[in-house]
């Protein structure tokens, strides 16, 4: 058993049929010695008396808020949560496996630039009695500070018969140099509590590997005289690291109709303009990627050909 | 300890092309190592990230763009002194700081070159003959060093009398390639910045 936060404890249980469970001793936080009784949750049934209560925790019925009282007055609470371990593996029931970029990916993180700011998100089908807390650091043995905000519900989607909820959190490395060469990864730890179930999820990454620039901005078209060709120009996104001559981007320019199966014109360039062939009912799209370290491409920025 | 704005004429910077080739060559070599050594811990997640130039050179700090010198987090640099003459300095206006930056890059390349050559000698003794260093990568390191053209004491190639542990050597190769790729990215950014300034 260990303390998650004040008056909240996590009991780690090997979860299998007829498991013996864990013996837990609760102590009432009071100078009183006599006349103390214990109850669980909203029940008035007295579980025991005395300053300490010893319980055998085997299942979720044994978890919950234990309260010690004296003469009708509440003295203190202890909330017990369960963390299940099945076949030596901690349970991952609360969050959905996003399976990208690989199986068992519960947390996904992205950074728009090298400033040390990043966003992580996760998915769940659970809608109520759910809380998250996020901690992060650079490295684990001698951790350097990363400050994370509160996790918030950022999107709701309908997936078949199920509703899916996306939560996200923003974090900022306390003293980040955009030009630094990372040797220690960022560690992100998410504590998830659903009713009386506790789970924790972690992710480890270098900012350079989670870079995904915002789409290029200010796309403009200029038809070329006596030609089917069009000059398309754009600018670096505002959120990208500066100076741009140091943090350079490369671009993919594509002309395509509405269907992905349609024919297309595609060209890659390090410049902020390109010449392409425009077709009726097609769109010109441009996306960006770090020129020197190939992490993710940005989403497309698009303008219609016509 | 930062790059000044006064640098060679645009498009005339002779090291840009070499640095692009360097990044390409080390990326290809790393990809080859990952594929060939698929049963070894050779991915970014599996290896320890070591920097053989740590406390010996300070390329990131010495080559910091002017715009980042206002960022306190970028300025916790170690002081290191370097020899300052080189052919990439294609302009009289080139400052001491830029010379320091380029000489730091030169020292990085020299250190990696020695490590890679020593490692290749060991890998050539491996009866499995599983992986060797790409000669193109070694040639590209050499070309960029020649373009930088700094006078510097030659570092003797490390020789070892004991029987090499090929497993350890291959893991060390992965560690070295990962670190060198990160440094090659920095070098490319620096050359691009100097070229544009």
């Amino acid at each position: 058993i260990w303390e998650l936060k004040k008056d909240v404890y996590v009991v780690e249980l090997d979860w299998y049929p007829d498991a013996p469970g864990e013996m837990v001793v609760l102590t009432c936080d009071t100078p009183e010695e006599d006349g103390i009784t214990w109850t669980l949750d909203q029940s008035s049934e007295v579980l025991g008396s005395g300053k300490t209560l010893t319980i055998q925790v085997k299942e979720f019925g044994d978890a919950g808020q234990y309260t010690c009282h004296k003469g009708g007055e509440v003295l203190s609470h202890s909330l017990l949560l369960l963390h299940k371990k099945e076949d030596g593996i901690w349970s991952t029931d609360i969050l959905k496996d996003q399976k990208e970029p690989k199986n068992k990916t519960f947390l996904r993180c992205e950074a728009k630039n090298y400033s040390g700011r990043f966003t992580c998100w996760w998915l769940t089908t659970i809608s109520t009695d759910l809380t998250f807390s996020v901690k992060s650091s650079r490295g684990s043995s001698d951790p350097q500070g990363v400050t994370c905000g509160a996790a918030t519900l950022s999107a709701e989607r309908v997936r078949g018969d199920n509703k899916e909820y996306e939560y996200s959190v923003e974090c900022q490395e306390d003293s980040a140099c955009p030009a630094a060469e990372e040797s220690l990864p960022i560690e992100v730890m998410v504590d998830a509590v659903h009713k009386l179930k506790y789970e924790n999820y972690t992710s480890s990454f270098f900012i350079r590997d989670i870079i995904k620039p915002d789409p290029p901005k200010n796309l403009q078209l200029k038809p070329l005289k006596n030609s089917r060709q069009v000059e398309v120009s754009w600018e670096y996104p505002d959120t990208w690291s500066t100076p741009h001559s140091y943090f350079s981007l490369t671009f993919c320019v594509q002309v395509q109709g509405k269907s992905k199966r349609e024919k297309k014109d595609r060209v890659f360039t390090d410049k902020t303009s390109a010449t392409v062939i425009c077709r009726k009912n097609a769109s010109i799209s441009v996306r960006a990627q770090d020129r020197y370290y190939s992490s993710s491409w940005s989403e497309w920025a698009s303008v219609p050909c016509s | 300890r930062n790059l000044p704005v006064a640098t060679p004429d645009p498009g005339m910077f002779p090291c840009l092309h070499h640095s692009q080739n360097l990044l390409r060559a080390v990326s290809n070599m790393l990809q080859k190592a990952r594929q060939t050594l698929e049963f070894y811990p050779c991915t970014s997640e599996e290896i320890d990230h070591e920097d053989i130039t740590k406390d010996k050179t300070s390329t990131v700090e010495a080559c910091l763009p002017l715009e980042l010198t206002k960022n306190e987090s970028c300025l916790n640099s170690r002081e290191t002194s370097f020899i300052t003459n080189g052919s990439c300095l294609a302009s009289r206006k080139t400052s001491f700081m830029m010379a320091l930056c380029l000489s730091s890059i030169y020292e990085d390349l020299k250190m990696y070159q020695v490590e890679f050559k020593t490692m290749n000698a060991k890998l050539l003794m491996d009866p499995k003959r599983q992986i060797f260093l790409d000669q193109n990568m070694l040639a590209v390191i050499d070309e960029l060093m020649q373009a930088l053209n700094f006078n510097s004491e030659t570092v003797p190639q490390k020789s070892s009398l004991e029987e090499p542990d090929f497993y350890k050597t291959k893991i060390k190769l992965c560690i070295l390639l990962h670190a060198f790729r990160i440094r090659a990215v920095t070098i490319d950014r620096v050359m691009s910045y100097l070229n544009a300034s």
Partner: antibody, heavy 118, light 107 residues
Framework: QVQLVQSGAEVKKPGSSVKVSCKAS????????LHWSRQAPGQGQEWMGW????????EYAPKFQGRVTITADESTSTAYMELSSLRSEDTAVYYC???????????WGQGTLVTVSS | DIVMTQSPLSLPVTPGEPASISCRAS??????LHWYQQKPGQQPRLLIA???QSISGVPSRFSGSGSGTDFTLTISSLQPEDFATYYC?????????FGQGTKVEIK
């Protein structure tokens, strides 16, 4: 299986014109760009131009501008390349090629040898 | 027009050995570079698109690298069926242009 089948070899006199056909099978004809390229004996490829069969849009290499005409007939899934004012240096194998991507070629015809000789 | 220069023009290789062909562009073309194989009396066949993207059906021993002005086609271990002429082609701008070809011959 996508295939491009070209017309047979031709012998032409200098100053005359030649029209080579390229019939496509497999896939929808108008879903692809169609290009023409040539290869003189012992030489590399030389790109001539492209057509979008969907709308008849064409673009020609400046070297051939005014001398080459690329057309397409959707009803027969056939593209044509006509080269006029032939000279001996136009002796080459002429290829049609296609792709959903405009700027490179994933399927090629078998080639048509055009010999220009007096 | 962008001029594409291949080297060497002829490359004698022992079967089973690796081979590398170089292609240089007269100006920077990013990764807009494609490789083809052509055997005598046959049409070209696409091997690699956009400098390094593999094409389905093409053996994995063929790989491409490069960007800007310098590109390489590598055949990791030459098989008897690989002896042919190889061409690079730029798609950075029209007119599309090809290299003059590299003939890979049996040593």
């Amino acid at each position: 299986q996508v295939q491009l089948v070209q017309s047979g070899a031709e012998v032409k006199k200098p100053g005359s014109s030649v029209k080579v056909s390229c019939k496509a099978s497999g896939g929808t004809f108008s879903d692809y760009y169609l290009h023409w390229s040539r290869q003189a004996p012992g030489q590399g490829q030389e790109w001539m131009g492209w057509i979008d069969p969907e709308n008849g849009d064409t673009e020609y290499a400046p070297k051939f501008q005014g001398r080459v005409t690329i057309t397409a007939d959707e009803s027969t899934s056939t593209a044509y390349m006509e080269l006029s004012s032939l000279r001996s240096e136009d002796t080459a194998v002429y290829y049609c090629a296609r792709n959903k991507e405009l700027r490179y070629f994933d399927v090629w015809g078998q080639g048509t040898l055009v010999t220009v000789s007096s | 027009d962008i001029v594409m220069t291949q080297s060497p023009l002829s490359l004698p290789v022992t079967p089973g050995e690796p081979a590398s062909i170089s292609c240089r562009a007269s100006q920077s073309i990013s990764i807009n570079l494609h490789w083809y194989q052509q055997k005598p009396g046959q049409q070209p066949r696409l091997l690699i698109a956009f400098a390094s993207q593999s094409i389905s059906g093409v053996p994995s021993r063929f790989s491409g690298s490069g960007s800007g002005t310098d590109f390489t086609l590598t055949i990791s271990s030459l098989q008897p069926e690989d002896f042919a002429t190889y061409y690079c082609q730029q798609s950075n701008s029209f007119p599309l242009t090809f290299g003059q070809g590299t003939k890979v011959e049996i040593k």
